[in-house]
């Protein structure tokens, strides 16, 4: 922490400008008025302050706004945003997409995933829902950031907005997030023809249930292996060898490469070996011929 001293007369600060570059930490602490700093935040980013100096300026703002910064200050944080912790950001109320854009630009190239996730969360809360303008801003300025939102926040996405989401925006989404987004996508694209529908729904299929995957297998979609590997394990296990063959079409040969990886490995263990042999891929690990399969979980549920 910077020690408190009185400001020497020749160091008194009347405006935030480049003359502050060579101030020591204790001089900044003593001589910069927090209200002046807040009023002239838009100037800070043009001045080559060091990490240490930015720490002092942040401390000033923290003292002035213990409950969280106003958006007029947040919008102009610039590189000072890199000093913020998720705890700091949780105190903010952000509604402006211009603020979001400005801070997303600053965070680019820095390890700020936790801060960015919290910022986006605050924007969604501030705006009341994840509307089209917010999604457009995220996809333009922060590909992949959509997946930083919790399933709860994603549930506020109206289906009409789903069309603005690009495949690369979902690359880092986990199963719980896709579970929320998939039904919305299904609704959003329901009026599309088979092939067009598949192209649109494909990035969301990590959230699809078994019955929808089974339905796709009847539509000659030729699902690529990358998409298949992202399907929920629970959605893949009940599929028959015939259904998987129809689902993948010419891509079925890729199963051999993924033989040891989930969900393919788990699916193989559930299939009869002679069914797997019909694929001619040399897949091993299926249930040997003549063995009975007892599903104990069903019996336990009945007792």
């Amino acid at each position: 922490d910077v020690e408190r001293t009185t400001c020497p007369p020749e160091k008194e600060v009347h405006e935030i400008d480049e003359s502050l570059i060579f101030y020591k930490k204790r001089e900044l602490e003593a001589c910069v008025d927090a209200a002046l700093l807040a009023a002239q935040m838009d100037r800070v980013d043009a001045i080559p302050f060091t990490y240490e100096q930015l720490d002092v300026l942040k401390h000033k703002l923290d003292e002035l706004y213990p409950q969280g910064y106003p958006e007029s200050v947040i919008r102009h944080l610039g590189h000072l945003f890199l000093k913020m912790s998720p705890e700091d950001i949780r105190k903010w109320n952000v509604t402006s997409l211009e603020t979001l854009k400005a801070l997303l630009k600053v965070s680019k190239g820095h390890e700020m995933s936790a801060q960015v996730a919290t910022l986006i969360d605050r924007v969604v809360v501030g705006r009341g829902q994840l509307d089209k303008d917010t999604v457009d801003t995220l996809t333009a300025f922060c590909p992949g950031c959509l997946c930083s939102l919790s399933p709860e926040r994603l549930s506020s996405v109206p289906p009409s907005v789903i069309g603005a989401v690009r495949p690369q925006d979902l690359d880092t989404c986990g199963p719980r997030q896709l579970d929320v987004l998939y039904p919305k996508a299904r609704l959003a694209f329901q009026n599309m023809s088979g092939s067009e529908y598949f192209v649109k729904i494909r990035p969301f299929l990590g959230g699809a249930p078994t019955e929808d995957v089974k339905a796709l297998s009847q539509q000659n979609v030729s699902m690529d292996l990358a998409t298949f590997m992202k399907l929920r394990r629970e959605a893949v296990l009940p599929l028959t060898v015939a259904e998987v063959q129809k689902l993948l079409g010419p891509h079925v040969e890729g199963l051999k490469v993924e033989e040891q990886h989930s969900p393919v490995r788990d699916w193989i263990l559930k299939q009869r070996q002679d069914d797997l042999d019909t694929l001619g891929l040399g897949l091993q690990g299926g249930i040997p011929n003549g063995y009975l399969i007892l599903d104990l979980s069903v019996r336990e549920a009945l007792s």
Partner: antibody
Framework: EFQLQQSGPELVKPGASVKISCKAS????????MNWVKQTNGKSLEWIGI????????SYNQKFKGKATLTVDQSSSTAYMQLNSLTSEDSAVYYC????????????WGQGTTLTVSS | QIVLTQSPAIMSASPGEKVTMTCSAS?????MYWYQQKPGSSPRLLIY???NLASGVPVRFSGSGSGTSYSLTISRMEAEDAATYYC?????????FGSGTELEIK
């Protein structure tokens, strides 16, 4: 060991531009601001400007605004100074110099780059 | 901008002799910095924040002063101290250097 290695001497014609480099090693380049200083005829020193290697923000002595442009390349830990519209007045030795922690002086200097502007 | 006037411009001292040079600022400054430069070499930081010795600088060097008047002292002159010494301020923007004091060995 901390080191600031500058590019070699330059002989250029009036009206031309030149870009001098300063490669940092032995410390975290983005943690310290970099300054540029001009020394004419082995006499006194003039501060040209300063750049923050982390953000690329810079500030200039009014006298050198429009004459000097400071940039950095983080990937190679190198600071650059471009001087344009050169005249004989720009002939000098130019130094890069790192600012110490909490503005405790220019603690490390490059070896200097001699610029001669002559037709 | 603040003008720093160094005096004397040139001086000489015998080995073992005490040497004092001054730097006068046109306006009050908070700190003074001192650099040593030998012919063909870069400046080297000697004193920072008026009186603190930079890393590797011999203890025979010391700095003092406040306001507009500052000084650099060498308690016992050695041959290797022959050089030009510059004061520098950055309390006021832009940073400025003095015109230098050239110290010769007698």
């Amino acid at each position: 060991e901390f080191q600031l290695q500058q590019s070699g001497p330059e002989l250029v014609k009036p009206g031309a531009s030149v870009k001098i480099s300063c490669k940092a090693s032995g410390y975290s380049f983005t943690d310290y601001n970099m300054n540029w200083v001009k020394q004419t005829n082995g006499k006194s020193l003039e501060w040209i400007g300063i750049i923050n290697p982390n953000y690329g923000t810079s500030s200039y002595n009014q006298k050198f605004k429009g004459k000097a442009t400071l940039t950095v390349d983080q990937s190679s830990s190198t600071a650059y100074m471009q001087l344009n519209s050169l005249t004989s007045e720009d002939s000098a030795v130019y130094y890069c110099a790192r600012v110490g922690r909490d503005n405790s002086g220019f603690d490390y200097w490059g070896q200097g780059t001699t610029l001669t502007v002559s037709s | 901008q603040i003008v720093l006037t160094q005096s004397p411009a040139i001086m000489s001292a015998s080995p073992g002799e005490k040497v004092t040079m001054t730097c006068s600022a046109s306006s009050s400054v908070s700190y003074m910095y001192w650099y040593q430069q030998k012919p063909g070499s870069s400046p080297r930081l000697l004193i920072y924040d008026t009186s603190n010795l930079a890393s590797g600088v011999p203890v025979r060097f010391s700095g003092s002063g406040s306001g507009t008047s500052y000084s650099l002292t060498i308690s016992r002159m050695e041959a290797e101290d022959a050089a030009t010494y510059y004061c520098q301020q950055w309390s006021s923007y832009p940073p400025t250097f003095g015109s230098g004091t050239e110290l010769e060995i007698k």
